[in-house]
């Protein structure tokens, strides 16, 4: 009997078998394993994708390709021998005994053979199709590079050439550069020697000032003394001789008084007979501490303690708490005496304030209150004023009732803003008020319209910065 | 150099209207408050008007409430008085001037006159027949 079935084995390759009788033929059909399959990005008989591959990956797959061929060919040659040599006793059984199916099966196989083969063809003619285009892709790529190649050596070359121009300028550079630093270092030298003698200069001159501001002082104090010592001498000649001119008098022994030495004010200066004006030592009430002040001995019968002078803008009054407390500056020229000092001062006695003023066009005011003092710093060394009389305004231009001091860093004032930063300088700031003596410095003609000047603006208005000021306190009853 | 410049005055009629202009320079009026003043012959400077916050505040004076309209063009750093209604009384040198918008007193709206700094030279502002 005979039959034939197809089947496929564990391999997944596809069988041919026929049964013959007692004989078996089994045709193993080759498979295409080593083209892929179409899932790939790259089908056997798909077009041509427009990124070229890497033409090693190329090369290599050709090589691949041309030994599948290679294969195909010999296993065709094999197969062909196999029927021609093997087949051929059986062929004469078969022609003799084959039955009409039979034939049927070999031409079946037959088909398939071919078709099979007629597959491998095409697939071969897609992949020279493909190498064809991979290859004239691969041959401009090439060209395109050594074109890029030529160029980017032409502008390698270029750019070599600027490098070294670049160098030799940079060295030129450097030359200067270097000559440069050596004038430079030299010069810096010089100029450091220069200044370390001025240093030393300055500061002997420095030492020469302080001592002769010492001598100017105790020469004032010196001459005071003798001009009381002359004025007490002439009292005592002038006593003796009356008595001696009366008869009837008894004979006395003239008892000084013991010489005052502490000083709280500059009213006690005056009364002791110091009367030129010039700088004092003054001692703190109740303690030994000393300060420096201006007593000015001419204004208005003399003995003022003057507590603030303005006159030149060299003196940075924007200060802080502790500085406005202690006092700044220098007595000689423009200065804050204290606040602590004058709190001190003015609470034990009664004291009145005058202020002058002096504006840009050769003006001069006043104010006069009659009670001043200030607060302890428990209070913000608040401002207590009142009787004002003077040339610099009807109504006060520090604001009643007093305010607290304020300054950069102790904001008491009663505005939103920070009167002592919009306005710059510590003072009895309300907000912000009618004054501030000592805000910023402004020369002539660049005076007005300043949200931050010298104002007192009873006597000159908003925005006028003032060209000198002075605050002086004396004892009520002097 | 804060400079303040007024225009905008002259002769007018009872009834008639004039719009005065204050230019100003050195200062931004985002962070100015300007007030128009004015000053009759032999009389004290008087507050009329006064506007902060690009506008959003205003304050007038009794007398000219309901005829008179402040105004301000930032882009143009100009605040405008616009007077309707004119009235003899009316007649005075007329100032704008500027302060600090921050300068304020806890729970005031607006600044007494001696904490405006800056002012302008005035313009003449007279109403008669």
């Known amino acids: 009997y005979s039959n034939f079935r197809k089947s496929v084995d564990s391999t997944g390759r596809r069988q041919y078998q026929v049964q013959n009788g007692p004989c078996s033929y089994t045709f193993l059909l080759p498979e295409t394993d080593s083209c892929r399959s179409s899932s790939s990005p790259y089908m056997s008989n798909a077009v041509q994708r427009d990124a070229p591959l890497d033409y090693d990956d190329s090369v290599q797959r050709l090589q691949v390709l041309e030994n599948i061929l290679e294969n195909n060919t010999q296993w065709l040659m094999k197969l062909e021998n196999y029927i021609q040599d093997n087949m051929k006793k059986e062929m004469v059984e078969i022609q003799q005994n084959v039955v009409q199916n039979q034939t049927a099966v070999m031409i079946e196989i037959g088909t398939s053979l071919l078709n099979q083969t007629a597959a491998q063809t095409r697939k071969l003619t897609d992949v020279e199709a493909q190498v064809l285009n991979q290859t004239t892709r691969l041959e401009l790529q090439l060209l395109q590079h050594s074109i890029s190649t030529n160029k980017l050596e032409k502008q390698i070359l270029d750019q070599t050439s600027e490098i070294n121009k670049l160098q030799n300028k940079n060295s030129f550079l450097e030359q200067k550069v270097l000559d440069m630093e050596g004038k430079h270092s030299e010069q810096l030298q010089s100029m450091k020697e220069q200044k370390d003698e001025l240093q030393v200069l300055v500061s002997k001159q420095s030492s020469v000032i302080d001592e002769l501001e010492k001598k100017l002082v105790t020469a004032t104090v010196n001459n005071s003394l003798l001009q009381k010592q002359q004025h007490d001498l002439m009292e005592t000649v002038n006593s003796l001789l009356t008595m001696m001119s009366s008869p009837n008098s008894k004979s006395s022994v003239a008892i000084r008084k013991e010489e005052q030495t502490t000083f709280r004010d500059c009213a006690e200066i005056f009364k002791s007979g110091l009367t030129t004006s010039g700088i004092y030592t003054l001692t703190f009430p109740n303690s030994t501490e000393e300060i420096k002040a201006y007593c000015d001995m001419d204004v208005g019968g003399g003995g003022w303690t003057v507590i603030q002078h303005r006159e030149d803008g060299s003196v940075d009054f924007q200060r802080t708490w502790k500085e406005y407390k202690e006092g700044f500056g220098s007595p000689l020229g423009e200065y804050w005496l204290g606040n602590e000092f004058v709190s001190q001062l003015t609470g034990q006695h009664r004291y009145v304030l005058k202020i002058q003023l002096k504006d840009w066009e050769g003006n001069e005011a006043h104010s006069l209150y009659d009670h001043f003092y200030l607060a302890g710093e428990e209070s913000n060394y608040r401002i207590h004023l009142t009787g004002l009389t003077g040339t610099a305004g009807k109504i006060s231009s520090i604001s009643q009732p007093g305010s607290d001091f304020s300054t950069k860093d102790s904001d008491n004032d009663k505005c939103i803003c920070k009167c002592s930063q919009m306005l710059s300088g510590g003072w009895w700031f309300d907000a912000c008020g009618p004054s501030n003596l000592n805000g910023q410095y402004y020369p002539q003609k660049q005076n007005t319209n300043k949200f931050n000047g010298i104002k007192w603006y009873y006597w000159k208005g908003s925005g006028y910065s003032l060209k000198a000021t002075t605050m002086m306190i004396r004892p009520a009853d002097f | 150099e804060v400079q303040l410049v007024e225009s905008g005055g002259g002769l007018v009629q009872p009834g008639g209207s004039l719009r005065l202009s204050c230019a100003a320079s050195?200062?931004?009026?985002?962070?100015?408050?300007i007030g128009w003043f004015r000053q009759a012959p032999g009389k004290e400077r008087e507050g009329v008007s006064a506007?902060?916050?690009?506008?959003?505040?205003?304050y007038y004076a009794d007398s000219v409430k309901g005829r008179f309209t402040i105004s301000s063009d930032n882009s143009k750093n100009t605040v405008y008085l616009q007077m309707n209604s004119l009235r003899p009384e009316d007649t005075a040198v007329y100032y704008c001037?500027?302060?600090?918008?921050?300068?304020?007193?806890?729970?005031?709206?607006?600044?007494?006159?001696?904490?405006?700094?800056?002012w302008g030279q005035g313009t003449l502002v007279t109403v008669s027949s």
């Open positions: 506007i902060r916050d690009n506008g959003g505040s205003t």
């Open positions: 001037a500027a302060v600090p918008a921050g300068r304020l007193r806890y729970g005031e709206q607006w600044y007494p006159i001696y904490e405006y700094d800056a």
């Open positions: 050195g200062i931004t009026l985002d962070d100015y408050a």
